[in-house]
Interface confidence: low
Amino acid sequence: SWMWNQFFLLEEYTGSDYQYVGKLHSDQDRGDGSLKYILSGDGAGDLFIINENTGDIQATKRLDREEKPVYILRAQAINRRTGRPVEPESEFIIKIHDINDNEPIFTKEVYTATVPEMSDVGTFVVQVTATDADDPTYGNSAKVVYSILQGQPYFSVESETGIIKTALLNMDRENREQYQVVIQAKDMGGQMGGLSGTTTVNITLTDVNDNPPRFPQSTYQFKTPESSPPGTPIGRIKASDADVGENAEIEYSITDGEGLDMFDVITDQETQEGIITVKKLLDFEKKKVYTLKVEASNPYVEPRFLYLGPFKDSATVRIVVEDVDEPPVFSKLAYILQIREDAQINTTIGSVTAQDPDAARNPVKYSVDRHTDMDRIFNIDSGNGSIFTSKLLDRETLLWHNITVIATEINNPKQSSRVPLYIKVLDVNDNAPTGLSTGA
């Protein structure tokens, strides 16, 4: 019968001679050269050669276990004289023994990962994996241990799983957003002499709302003409927020001040500015300065960061109302006067008064719009507004006179106002009756 054990052969042999595998031997072999050993199967005659007299097998080439771990061959022992087999053909195995000739290789050259800023220590970031082509069933050639080469003390890696976790408290995106971590995978359980490979992990801290809005200045001042209609924007304020996205969104509100009912603030969603607008008609003569307290706040707040302080800030907004030069204002919308038809020339009928409503109280002069009094029947004292006749009247000719009086600011002739005057001519018995006279 055949006499051998399973053959083992170390891979990656570097010797100058052929590598000895083992010996095929039949108990029928008496050592007299009467038997001939024949090898067939995987690599026979090429990779593996046999001394047909002695049964010694040698490998002619360097073998790579990772390419082929097992070779299955067949052995024959033939009687040289008869040409007959002295043993039944038998299959045998050459098993290639592993050496540590493969370094761990990561599944990706570069990994990309994100983790929220300010995460607790130990927060999962990403798992990296390296594989080793060596034999995992024998020795530690394929036992991979992970370690961090660059990226401490921010991140750590679990040596057995390749799970990267945060290693520092309060990692702040606003201070630093990008981290490049280099992870090493080393075989032989990380021991000396192990082979290693590395990968880069680009980690980005994603934003959380850990920063409140902050006004860059405590006081703002804007001016607006008193003529600004409701809805007019009069100024923009902007609080800055170091966060990004919805964490940096800001809402503005007026929380206090004399102008609470006079102004509004709206948030410009695009620029994240607060736009102060006029809410009610302003009047310089009534109030010249308003002081508001405007608040900027984050609409989306993370409760766990409330200990950092309120997620809002306030600023004082001072609004100065600008005077707009307004025309004189008459004491009445219209005047109705009466005069007897027998009034003498220069008889005073009445008077009108107008006043500059501006704080300057500019003096006013009066005149009659001659388009409304072509016959120049009436006149006005330009200084005091007294209306008097400049011609004799006749009720029978015209019962009502409708004229317009103009009031003009002396210092600013562009500012003028008009008012209608309705003058009624009262009847005087100055006409004899007319009729047909008949004789007796």
Epitope: M118, L168, E174, N175, Q180, V182, L308
Partner: antibody, heavy 122, light 106 residues
Framework: EVQLVQSGAEVKKPGASVKVSCKAS????????MHWVRQAPGQGLEWMGW????????EYNQKFQGRVTITADRSTSTAYMELSSLRSEDTAVYFC???????????????WGQGTLVTVSS | DIQMTQSPSSLSASVGDRVTITCKAS??????LAWYQQKPGKAPKLLIY???TLQTGVPSRFSGSGSGSDFTLTISSLQPEDFATYFC????????FGQGTKVEIK
């Protein structure tokens, strides 16, 4: 804009103590480490220690252990460095410097105070 | 403790020259290195961090390279305002500065 403004120059006798201040503005004082670095005339820079104003924890260079005390006043956003038992070789410009990271006493220094000259002479 | 060795300790150059300063760490510090510029009577100013990242506002003629234990600061075309002392600093483990390189006018 981040600013660190230090107190003025000091002249001290050997054996005395000196306390240098560093007032911070333009950022949340409690959220960044504050370091102290000194530079002897014509010499290089030497790290002395840090404080985390958020909780007052400190770390000192072994060389100065027992002689240096770093404190912080959160109400005024001011850090202080006190060096005792002064000797002539302590003559140097003392700088405060903000650590770039909020939650880590490592890293580089992104903003520096203007420096305070301390002269130790008898 | 990690020691930082800077070379040369001083150099003379002219405006427009390319200037290279090297810094060697006593052990592997990966890319945990910063470069600072200091002018007489002034505080150091951060130029480069993480070995090769330019600090905001620093002119692009400054660049940093290196990893592990050997690092270089390069000024591609020296300007009049660049005459100063340059320090490297490691922050891999604690803090240590190089002894400085003074760049003087030739």
């Amino acid at each position: 804009e981040v600013q660190l403004v230090q107190s003025g120059a000091e002249v001290k006798k050997p054996g005395a103590s000196v306390k240098v201040s560093c007032k911070a503005s333009g950022y949340t004082f409690t959220r960044n480490f504050m370091h102290w670095v000194r530079q002897a005339p014509g010499q290089g820079l030497e790290w002395m220690g840090w404080i985390y104003p958020g909780d007052g924890e400190t770390e000192y260079n072994q060389k100065f252990q027992g002689r240096v005390t770093i404190t912080a006043d959160r109400s005024t956003s001011t850090a202080y460095m006190e060096l005792s038992s002064l000797r002539s070789e302590d003559t140097a410009v003392y700088f405060c410097a903000r650590g770039v990271y909020g939650g880590f006493a490592g890293g580089y220094f992104d903003f520096w105070g203007q420096g305070t000259l301390v002269t130790v002479s008898s | 403790d990690i020691q930082m060795t800077q070379s040369p300790s001083s150099l003379s150059a002219s405006v427009g020259d390319r200037v290279t300063i090297t810094c060697k760490a006593s052990q592997n510090i990966y890319k945990n290195l910063a470069w600072y510029q200091q002018k007489p009577g002034k505080a150091p100013k951060l130029l480069i961090y993480d070995a090769n990242t330019l600090q905001t506002g620093v002119p692009s003629r400054f660049s940093g390279s290196g990893s592990g234990s050997d690092f270089t600061l390069t000024i591609s075309s020296l300007q009049p305002e660049d005459f100063a002392t340059y320090f490297c600093q490691q922050y891999y483990s604690g803090w240590a500065f190089g002894q400085g390189t003074k760049v003087e006018i030739k």
